[in-house]
Interface confidence: low
């Protein structure tokens, strides 16, 4: 049967039975051999106890005495088969074995669930010399036990190749419930079930386990360990923690925030970036983002202007790089932009709307009823033109750019003139006589050139021709007029 | 490990112009905007602008407008800063900085000096 | 642009004890729930840290005895307990719009 001692139980005497007059205090030993040395454990377990010596693994020794008697078998004595303790307390435990003297270099080690315990282990193995025997008691001590330090402890020597081992001692190292796995913080949709897992062990077993929501018990019973916590769902941030119980405790985990998916707050911070005639680049940086991530944002654009009734425009996008390019603006135009984004909950609010404005913009219309003729007697060539309807948005008209072409015997020559705005005609000087001349004409703001008008042919003739007729932009159909004058 | 890695001092003469590379790595360079800082020796600091690599896009504090042009290299991770018509005020050791919810990342800083 | 007002200029603070600095924003930098205002340290030859973004969210890696608060257009930087390391020049940045302005910063001396 196994001998078992707990922490409270009494200290054996130091060395019982069976060695001649019990080791009297004058018989100090010859040899002590400490690994280590100025412990006073807490607690000792003698190395012998009453009863017959072990008996599985012996070594019978071959050699006889003068009286041809054999030794008896050799053994390690019977010790404490398993000691419980407190984490962090000291232990000392020892094995016996008395060997005659006929053998020499005898060493005993330490071996832990089948590996030999080398290095600084406070270890100490002690030489108690007899006429016939010594006694060899060697100790096993640790300062302070961890969980680490639970395990079956034995003692082995060799005699003649041979191989003698103690019966284990079993180290129990009990305390407070140790977290092998603690609920984890979740961003949770709300009002849906969701699932938290909490496990400790001893020893000492059993663990059981309590649930704590917002400090307070949730299940009146423990549950053993591990448990799962099913909780149907909430309504509001909450924090859960766990409790551990066994007989030496309690155990508290961390406690973790369950937090509530929610709609994002909405993007601060829109700014503008850059702005063109018929487009604005925005940023924004996104508002919190609900406990979920964000999936795409969108862009609300609508006029500023309190006369229009124009409806909001929308425009998606990702989520980043917070960054977007608003295009199919009309020119010269105030907006008010608005920016929200979205996780898998919903949208969020629309920021702080802000204003934006977009450039003035090329004319988007050529001038109308184009007319060209030759002005012989002073060698011009004479243009005129209407006005183009320019919208508001295009910006203020700032003149006008003539293109014109003149094509003789091969040889093609363009020239661009620039008109203010005032006009509506313009004198060209001739080029090239005996050549074709194609007016073209198209208005000009800040913005930009706009289309230039169809293309105008007159035929410049040699000097002395008559100038009979103008040549005009054609009605709708006539594609290349030429006029010959 | 996001690292921003700034070029050593400058020596520049007035009325010159410098340019500050900040070559970034460890992030997509594209997702963030690089933030540009200004600090004059024993003087607090002052943002000057940032730039999102994405389409380069820039935006600039008024006191540096004109001053100061931001611009990136996708292809090699590298933002950069031109100052020009360099004055001693503009004496100072300036950062790069990723954008973000306060800035996490921060180059080392090149000191520029300006001096005859 | 928001002027960001540090105070106090310099502090003087025995190892151990709290630091308290303080900044006051010129306009709300808050919205929807969020302040758009961050902590860094800097101390010399070096590029600021970031310590707390948001105003009282802790960067990563940063001490736990780094905490910020907010009430109003008022923000707290507290360090408790201050220990000898924390010696350096402190900045808070708003981030509510652009520009983006720092205050003036405040130098916390150890004792």
């Known amino acids: 049967a196994i001998t078992e001692a707990r922490e409270e139980a009494k200290p054996y005497p130091l060395f019982p039975g069976p060695f001649p007059g019990s080791l009297q205090t004058d018989h100090t030993p010859l040899l002590s051999l400490p690994h280590a040395s100025g412990y006073q454990p807490a607690l000792m377990f003698s190395p012998t106890q009453p009863g017959r010596p072990h008996t599985g693994n012996v070594a019978i020794p071959q050699v006889t005495s003068v009286e041809s008697k054999p030794l008896p078998p050799l053994a390690f004595k019977h010790t404490v088969g398993h000691i419980i303790l407190s984490e962090h307390k000291g232990v000392k435990f020892n094995c016996s074995i008395s060997v005659p003297n006929i053998y020499q270099d005898t060493t005993i080690s330490w071996w832990k669930d089948g590996k030999e315990l080398l290095g600084a282990h406070h270890a100490i193995t002690q030489f108690y010399p007899d006429d016939e025997v010594t006694a060899i008691i060697a100790s096993f001590s640790i300062t302070s036990v961890q969980r680490s330090d639970n395990g079956s402890y034995i003692c082995k020597m060799k005699i003649n190749n041979e191989e003698i081992v103690s019966d284990p001692i079993y180290i129990e190292v009990q305390g407070l419930p140790h977290f092998t796995k603690q609920p984890e913080s979740m961003n949770v949709t709300r009002n849906t079930a969701f699932n938290l897992t909490c496990q400790a062990v001893g020893p000492p077993e059993p663990v059981n386990i309590f649930w704590v929501q917002n400090s307070s018990r949730v299940n009146e019973q423990p549950e053993k360990s591990p448990s799962v916590l099913t909780v149907p769902g909430l309504t509001e941030m909450a924090v859960f923690s766990c409790e551990a119980h066994n007989d030496k405790g309690l155990t508290v985990s961390k406690g973790v925030q369950i937090n509530i998916k929610a709609i994002p707050s909405p993007p601060t911070e829109v700014s503008i970036r850059n702005s063109t005639a018929h487009s604005i680049l925005i940023s924004w940086v996104p508002g919190f983002d609900g406990y979920s991530p964000f999936r795409n944002c969108s862009i609300q654009v609508k006029e500023a202007d309190p006369l229009s009734n124009g409806s909001v425009m929308i425009f998606n996008t990702s989520a980043l790089p917070h960054l977007y390019q608003i295009k199919q603006l009309q020119a010269l135009a105030n907006y008010s932009i608005g920016v929200s984004c979205m996780n898998e909950i919903g949208w969020s609010a629309v920021s702080p709307w802000i204003l934006a404005s977009t450039t003035e913009g090329a004319p988007s219309v050529a001038p109308l009823n184009v007319t060209v003729f030759l002005n012989e007697s002073s060698d011009n060539v004479d243009i005129r033109w209407m006005k183009p309807p320019t919208k508001q948005q295009d910006g203020e008209l700032v003149g006008y750019r003539i293109s014109h072409v003149w094509q003789s015997a091969g040889i093609s020559k363009e020239l661009l003139e620039e008109v203010g705005q005032n006009g509506s005609r313009a004198r060209i000087s001739v080029q090239v006589h005996n050549a074709t001349c194609t007016v073209r004409i198209a208005a000009v703001t800040r913005g930009g050139v706009g289309p230039f008008s169809d293309p105008v042919k007159i035929f410049i003739p040699a000097h002395g021709w008559v100038d009979y007729a103008p040549s005009s932009t054609p009605a709708p159909g006539n594609a290349d007029p030429v006029l010959i004058i | 490990e996001v690292q921003l890695q700034q070029s050593g001092p400058e020596l520049v003469k007035p009325g010159a112009s410098v340019r500050i590379p900040c070559k970034a790595s460890?992030?997509?360079?594209?997702?963030?905007?690089m933030d540009w800082v200004k600090q004059s020796h024993g003087k607090s600091l002052e943002w000057i602008g940032n730039i999102n690599p994405n389409i380069g896009g820039t935006i600039y504090s008024q006191k540096f407008k004109g001053k100061a042009t931001l611009t990136v290299d996708k292809s090699s991770s590298t933002a950069y800063m031109e100052l020009r018509s360099l004055t001693s005020e503009d004496t100072a050791v300036y950062y790069c900085?990723?954008?973000?919810?306060?800035?996490?990342?921060w180059g080392q800083g090149t000191l520029v000096t300006v001096s005859a | 642009d928001i002027v960001l007002t540090q105070s106090p200029a310099s502090l003087t603070v025995s190892l151990g004890q709290r630091a308290t600095i303080s900044c006051r924003a010129s306009r709300s930098v808050s919205t929807s729930g969020y302040s758009y205002m961050h902590w860094y340290q800097q101390k010399p030859g070096q590029p600021p840290k970031l310590l707390i973004y948001l105003a009282s969210n802790l960067e990563s890696g940063v001490p736990a005895r780094f905490s910020g608060s907010r009430s109003g257009t008022d923000f707290t930087l507290n360090i408790h307990p201050v220990e000898e390391e924390d010696a350096a020049t402190y900045y808070c940045?708003?981030?509510?719009?652009?520009?983006?302005?720092f205050g003036s910063g405040t130098k916390l001396e150890i004792k």
């Open positions: 460890g992030y997509t360079f594209s997702d963030y905007n």
């Open positions: 940045q708003h981030s509510r719009e652009y520009p983006f302005t």
């Open positions: 900085a990723r954008g973000d919810y306060g800035f996490a990342s």
